[in-house]
């Protein structure tokens, strides 16, 4: 269940994708990743109000405990939902090799 | 792929699974849930430091990012890796009935 | 990118060149030596990553040892033959072809 | 190992003119593009002029533009200036390590 999209923080301050640029030395790939040079990595960025975006059961619960417990229960956290694919071209101990990695770019945000 | 289990900042503190005692009333069900009338709620709480329990590629990027780029990029966050099932007596319109959730309760925890 | 002097040495007397740098740092860049036989082409010997570990290509058959520290990128001449004899280029880059090389230092290797 | 054939040399050019020199490999190189061109002149090390292929190097100028994918590539120079009589290699980067290196190499004269 994907509850409310509208946020009440204002514009762009609740989770969302961000997209950050990093160069393979940011990332500590230098070594064992050729290219890309520099990747343009999306992120789950922003503050998981009440019920806005919420994933789950699980992250209705935890809105509904924070607020009650806020020094025991931290909110929902914005979190990838969905990933888009990437491939790197790696270094291997003979040589180079493709990989695809379907966890490294995130598609979609939720909080959780 | 999941980094180490070893918490850097002290027993317990990093992140793992917590059980948190809620009522119906806590929880805002009491006008539809009519069983069970508090629920053990098993959440995914505490820090997640470099490499710690790293879900995936990307909570790993995260690490190396929020490392460089802390007031941009948050630290990655402890939440449910998987789910156990709960069973709910609900209200119906007409009576009552059983209700699988699949997503309330966390089983496993990761960073992410 | 410059390579120490080079010199006259005798067949199977181990030679090692060194390639300092200056303007970038060498544990950010891939960095690679390439030498040329008087009035011939260029010959790639190999690579060194970042951290690091050294690659090589095939004619090389571990005749050659390329090593890094923090500040220095060394190439080991380990049995050198008077095939061996040419100008050692040290250059940075590896994939993106190689954009800063050193004026080359002359090897000559005779009895 | 990889057989990387250049244009035979020499290659003679008239400045104003336009010269083109092609790089055949018995391969591919890595992500079809892995390639770079490099000119260089009598008791100087190479210069980095296009990698990737077709990107020009920085402080490279136009004149020299780089094509081509997979196996087969091309270096043109328009307007050829008196200062572009070098000899030209190229160099490809491939899946296995020891098949990397160079062209024999295309010498370029400007009449």
């Known amino acids: 269940a994907r509850n409310g999209d509208h946020c009440p923080l204002g514009p762009g301050r609740c989770c969302r994708l961000h997209t950050v640029r990093a160069s393979l030395e940011d990332l500590g790939w230098a070594d064992w990743v050729l290219s890309p040079r520099e990747v343009q990595v999306t992120m789950c960025i922003g503050a998981c109000p009440s019920q806005f975006r919420a994933a789950n059961m699980h992250a209705q619960i935890k809105t509904s405990l924070h607020r009650l417990k806020p020094d025991t229960v931290p909110a929902p956290c914005c979190v990838p939902a969905s990933y888009n694919p990437m491939v790197l071209i790696q270094k291997t101990d003979t040589g180079v090799s493709l990989q695809t990695y379907d966890d490294l770019l995130a598609k979609d945000c939720h909080c959780i | 792929a999941r980094n180490g289990d070893h918490c850097p900042l002290g027993p317990g503190r990093c992140c793992r699974l917590h059980t948190v005692r809620a009522s119906l009333e806590d929880l805002g069900w009491a006008d539809w849930v009519l069983s069970p009338r508090e629920v053990q709620v098993t959440m995914c709480i505490g820090a997640c430091p470099s490499q710690f329990r790293a879900a995936n590629m990307h909570a790993q990027i995260k690490t190396s990012l929020h490392r460089l780029k802390p007031d941009t990029v948050p630290a990655p966050c402890c939440v449910p890796a998987s789910y156990n099932p709960m069973v709910l007596i609900q209200k119906t319109d007409t009576g009552v009935s059983l209700q699988t959730y699949d997503d309330l309760l966390a089983k496993d925890c990761h960073c992410i | 990118v410059k390579e120490s002097e080079g010199r006259l040495v005798t067949p199977g007397t181990p030679l090692t060149l060194t390639c300092t740098a200056s303007?970038?740092?060498?544990?950010?860049?891939?960095m690679s030596w390439v030498r040329q036989a008087p009035g011939k082409g260029l010959e790639w010997i190999g690579f060194v990553s970042p951290s690091g570990r050294a690659y090589y290509t095939s004619w090389v058959n571990g005749r050659f040892t390329i090593s890094k520290t923090s500040t220095t990128v060394d190439l080991k001449i380990t049995s050198p033959t008077t095939e061996d004899t040419a100008t050692y280029f040290c250059a940075r880059g590896y994939t993106s072809g190689l954009d800063i090389w050193g004026p080359g230092t002359l090897v000559t290797v005779s009895s | 190992a990889i057989d990387m054939t250049q244009t035979p040399s020499p290659v003679s050019a008239t400045v104003g003119g336009t010269v083109t020199i092609s790089c055949q490999s018995s391969?591919?190189?890595?992500?079809?593009?892995?390639l770079a061109w490099y000119q260089q002149k009598p008791g100087q090390p190479p210069k980095l002029l296009i990698y990737d292929a077709a990107t020009l190097a920085s402080g490279v100028p136009s004149r020299f533009k780089g094509s081509g994918s997979g196996t087969q590539f091309t270096l043109t120079i328009s307007d050829v200036q008196c200062a572009d009589a070098a000899t030209y290699y190229c160099?490809?980067?491939?899946?296995?390590?020891?098949?990397?290196?160079f062209g024999g190499g295309t010498e370029v004269v400007v009449k």
């Open positions: 160099a490809g980067v491939y899946n296995n390590d020891s098949d990397n290196g």
């Open positions: 303007g970038f740092s060498l544990s950010s860049h891939w």
């Open positions: 391969k591919s190189v890595v992500n079809g593009d892995w």
